[in-house]
């Protein structure tokens, strides 16, 4: 993603990403010279997020909403350069990215939206689900957030094992270099997660349209 079009709008950030960013800034202020142990820091952030009240999370949810609006606004006017439609190679054996809480919620309520509005386009179904999610109280989002956090934890373990296990010889030579870029890569992946999820959701919608006869 870093090597992509510099004019491309920055990916939208989730409420959790804003929270992590705030944590990082706080940490930097308190310990300007200390180096950050990424996995330990992530764990602490995640634990803190889980114990936060709906009120405390609200601030970050508002930031995410505003950033989503900014991203959508910028994407409307963004024209990708020619030939930039190819996706980077993805190993089919790599652990599948975990779904977000919103994605899990969509899986629960998409059948209802599609059933009540049979003529609705994929985009409009997604829009309705987005509205539904935004109108859902924080405590009602919690079961989905808990499940998403569990799946994220599992994914992080799986991806670590996957990375440790199978790298071609050429890659092994660059281990030291790779470690240094790992932190940056993980930050980029956080941004990519959301884009991938949107794509997966569209694919899932298309699959479901084929499966609708079963319902």
């Amino acid at each position: 993603m870093g090597k992509g079009d510099p004019k491309k709008p920055r990916g939208k950030m989730s409420s959790y990403a804003f929270f992590v960013q705030t944590c990082r800034e706080e940490h930097k202020k308190k310990h300007p010279d200390a180096s950050v142990n990424f996995s330990e820091f992530s764990k602490k952030c995640s634990e803190r997020w889980k114990t936060m009240s709906a009120k405390e999370k609200g601030k970050f949810e508002d930031m995410a909403k505003a950033d989503k609006a900014r991203y959508e606004r910028e994407m409307k006017t963004y024209i990708p350069p020619k030939g930039e439609t190819k996706k980077k190679f993805k190993d089919p054996n790599a652990p599948k990215r975990p779904p977000s809480a919103f994605f899990l919620f969509c899986s629960e309520y998409r059948p209802k939206i599609k059933g009540e509005h049979p003529g609705l386009s994929i985009g409009d179904v997604a829009k309705k689900l987005g509205e539904m999610w935004n109108n859902t109280a924080a405590d009602d989002k919690q079961p989905y957030e808990k499940k998403a956090a569990k799946l994220k934890e599992k994914y992080e373990k799986d991806i670590a094992a996957y990375r440790a296990k199978g790298k071609p010889d050429a890659a092994k030579k660059g281990v030291v270099k790779a470690e240094k870029s790992k932190k940056k890569k993980e930050e980029e992946e956080d941004e990519e997660d959301e884009e991938d999820e949107e794509e997966e959701e569209d694919e899932e919608d298309e699959d479901e349209e084929e499966d609708d006869d079963d319902e």
Epitope: A54, E108, G115, A137, D140, K141, K147
Partner: antibody, heavy 120, light 107 residues
Framework: EVQLLESGGGLVQPGGSLRLSCAAS????????TGWVRQAPGKGLEWVSG????????QYADSVKGRFTISRDNSKNTLYLQMNSLRAEDTAVYYC?????????????WGQGTLVTVSS | DIQMTQSPSSLSASVGDRVTIICRAN??????LNWYQQKPGKAPKLLIS???SLESGVPSRFSGSGSGTEFTLSISSLQPEDFASYYC?????????FGQGTNLEIR
């Protein structure tokens, strides 16, 4: 017409178990979050538990957590409440209710209720 | 837990009267406030959701307002079938608590 019909209530001794059922009809059951709300004799309403459309996500009031289990069978259009380690304070009319707006606890349809009496 | 307090607990009124029931939350619940009507021996019936949205089939003499911590249910001109108990409920935070109820009786 939307209908919710509870059954399974009755007299049980403290420490005993009971399983309530709620048969749904008149709507696509698998689209809706459903749950249980109870009302002690002559008292107000108390939310007990909720379950998502697929049955994959559940919520409980602290007063019943670890003792009650909510579940559903979408193929049978039925909601269940397994109640274990029953106490005198669980005595109430148990209503099955549908959440009409996504995961938000707005109960737009209710059953007629089934009475659970916990007494020795 | 969020505590919901209704006032008054009971209310006597006559057909044609305008009545108002107040529901207070001990912390902010935005507009996640719903009103139910219950008649003796029957299940509750949803009247208003999200503070002010009237459910379909509910007469327009019923209305709801408020936000934050204070909410009201108003009945503009009481009809004989309106004599019942009324409950407010917050759907903002688990456990989803109800008010203790207001019993509306014929004077």
């Amino acid at each position: 017409e939307v209908q919710l019909l509870e059954s399974g209530g009755g007299l049980v001794q403290p420490g005993g178990s009971l399983r309530l059922s709620c048969a749904a009809s008149g709507f696509t059951f698998s689209w809706y979050e459903t749950g249980w709300v109870r009302q002690a004799p002559g008292k107000g309403l108390e939310w007990v538990s909720g379950i998502s459309p697929s049955g994959g996500y559940t919520q409980y009031a602290d007063s019943v957590k670890g003792r009650f289990t909510i579940s559903r069978d979408n193929s049978k259009n039925t909601l269940y409440l397994q109640m274990n380690s029953l106490r005198a304070e669980d005595t109430a009319v148990y209503y099955c209710a549908r959440s009409g707006v996504g995961a938000t606890k707005i109960f737009d349809y209710w059953g007629q209720g089934t009475l659970v009496t916990v007494s020795s | 837990d969020i505590q919901m307090t209704q006032s008054p607990s009971s209310l006597s009124a006559s057909v044609g009267d305008r009545v108002t029931i107040i529901c207070r939350a001990n912390e902010r619940i935005n507009t996640y406030l719903n009103w139910y009507q219950q008649k003796p021996g029957k299940a509750p019936k949803l009247l208003i959701s999200g503070t002010s949205s009237l459910e379909s089939g509910v007469p327009s003499r019923f209305s709801g307002s408020g936000s934050g911590t204070e909410f009201t249910l108003s009945i503009s001109s009481l009809q004989p079938e309106d004599f019942a108990s009324y409950y407010c409920q917050q759907s903002y935070s688990s456990p989803y608590t109800f008010g203790q109820g207001t019993n509306l009786e014929i004077r």
